[in-house]
Interface confidence: medium
């Protein structure tokens, strides 16, 4: 079987004009999952970003995160982007304040 | 900084069950998961399995009936179990952490251990 | 199973010249999920490029990966004698996750 996850992104703000962006993901089935941040479509290199493992979520489903720190004022330059059993998408950062995106493939 | 170091018996005879560690250090068992690799002498590299962070295990269908890997947490230590040994077992066994955003690729790896399967 | 096919199983190259190294899967593998190893003798292997071409740290600039499918190289624009090891692709894209045999780079 598969389950797509689904995908939500957040924003924290942060000291110093850099604010933390969080992508989600969630109720997903197979294990195996891609999740990274691109600046400009390219992927951070590994150092800048920071993973949680993945894990289940108590409904024989998995969920993960990626997150990373980039400026205040260039969100819309950074997406999350997610692969997972030969499906993928592309979650930008919610403009504005601290707002969250959910997406469902 | 991040050290794996895998021990056990350098000698198991047939049919009995090879048992090794790998104790680790610089990163956290909770964290991070890991994979079992092996190593016939001379020639190439077979995945075994690994265990998620939560202790759940995946196995190469291969070794599925005779494999267990482990968790003990308060010792930092993880294990491989492999019953009813051959001497088609004889490996250099590897432990290997699972990176996180490396999409599961093993960033950090024991040094090896030779296990010989011999009467 | 994913059948990992490296080529060629050896390559007799000097110092200073670029090697090519292929790794052909039996089915379609996500770029995501292709890894490459170096091993030296007596060593354990060590991740030298990670979703088929994001070098690992502390892997030097001289390495790349590329491909996409069934097909992946890794290239070594200019061989310095440390070069000289055991080279493996791996695939985590279907369980088992499986090995190529290794390619063996020597001193010509």
């Known amino acids: 079987r598969t389950v797509p996850p689904m995908v939500n992104v957040t924003c924290s703000e942060v000291s110093e004009g850099n604010i933390t962006v969080t992508c989600r993901a969630s109720s997903f089935y197979p294990r195996n999952i891609t999740l990274t941040w691109r600046q400009d479509g390219v992927s951070l290199s590994h150092n800048t970003q920071q993973w949680g493992d993945v894990l289940p979520d108590g409904n024989g489903t998995y969920q993960t995160w990626v997150a990373t720190r980039i400026r205040q004022g260039e969100e819309q330059r950074f997406t999350c982007y997610m692969e997972h059993s030969g499906n993928h998408g592309t979650h930008p950062v919610p403009s504005g304040k601290v707002l969250a995106l959910q997406s469902q493939w | 900084q991040v050290q794996l170091q895998e021990s056990g018996p350098g000698l198991v005879k047939p049919s009995e069950t090879l048992s090794l560690t790998c104790t680790v250090s610089?990163?956290?068992?909770?964290?991070?998961?890991v994979h079992w690799i092996r190593q016939p002498p001379g020639k190439g590299l077979e995945w075994i399995g690994m265990i998620w962070t939560d202790g759940t295990t995946d196995y190469n269908a291969a070794f599925i009936s005779r494999v267990t890997i482990s968790v003990d947490t308060s010792k930092n230590q993880f294990s491989l179990k492999l019953s009813s040994v051959t001497a088609a077992d004889t490996a250099v066994y590897y432990c290997a952490r699972k990176g996180h955003g490396y999409y599961y690729a093993m960033d950090y790896w024991g040094q090896g251990t030779l296990v010989t399967v011999s009467s | 199973e994913i059948v990992l096919t490296q080529s060629p199983g050896t390559l007799s190259l000097s110092p200073g010249e670029r090697a090519t190294l292929s790794c052909t899967a039996s089915s379609s593998v996500s770029s995501s999920y292709l890894h490459w190893y170096q091993q030296k003798p007596g060593q354990a292997p060590r991740l030298l490029i990670y979703s088929t071409s994001n070098l690992a740290s502390g892997i030097p600039d001289r390495f790349s990966g590329s491909g996409s499918g069934t097909d992946f190289t890794l290239t070594i624009s200019r061989l310095e004698p440390e070069d000289f090891a055991v080279y493996y692709c791996h695939q985590y894209h279907r369980s088992p996750f499986t090995f190529g045999q290794g390619t063996k780079l020597e001193i010509k």
């Open positions: 610089g990163f956290s068992l909770t964290t991070y998961g």
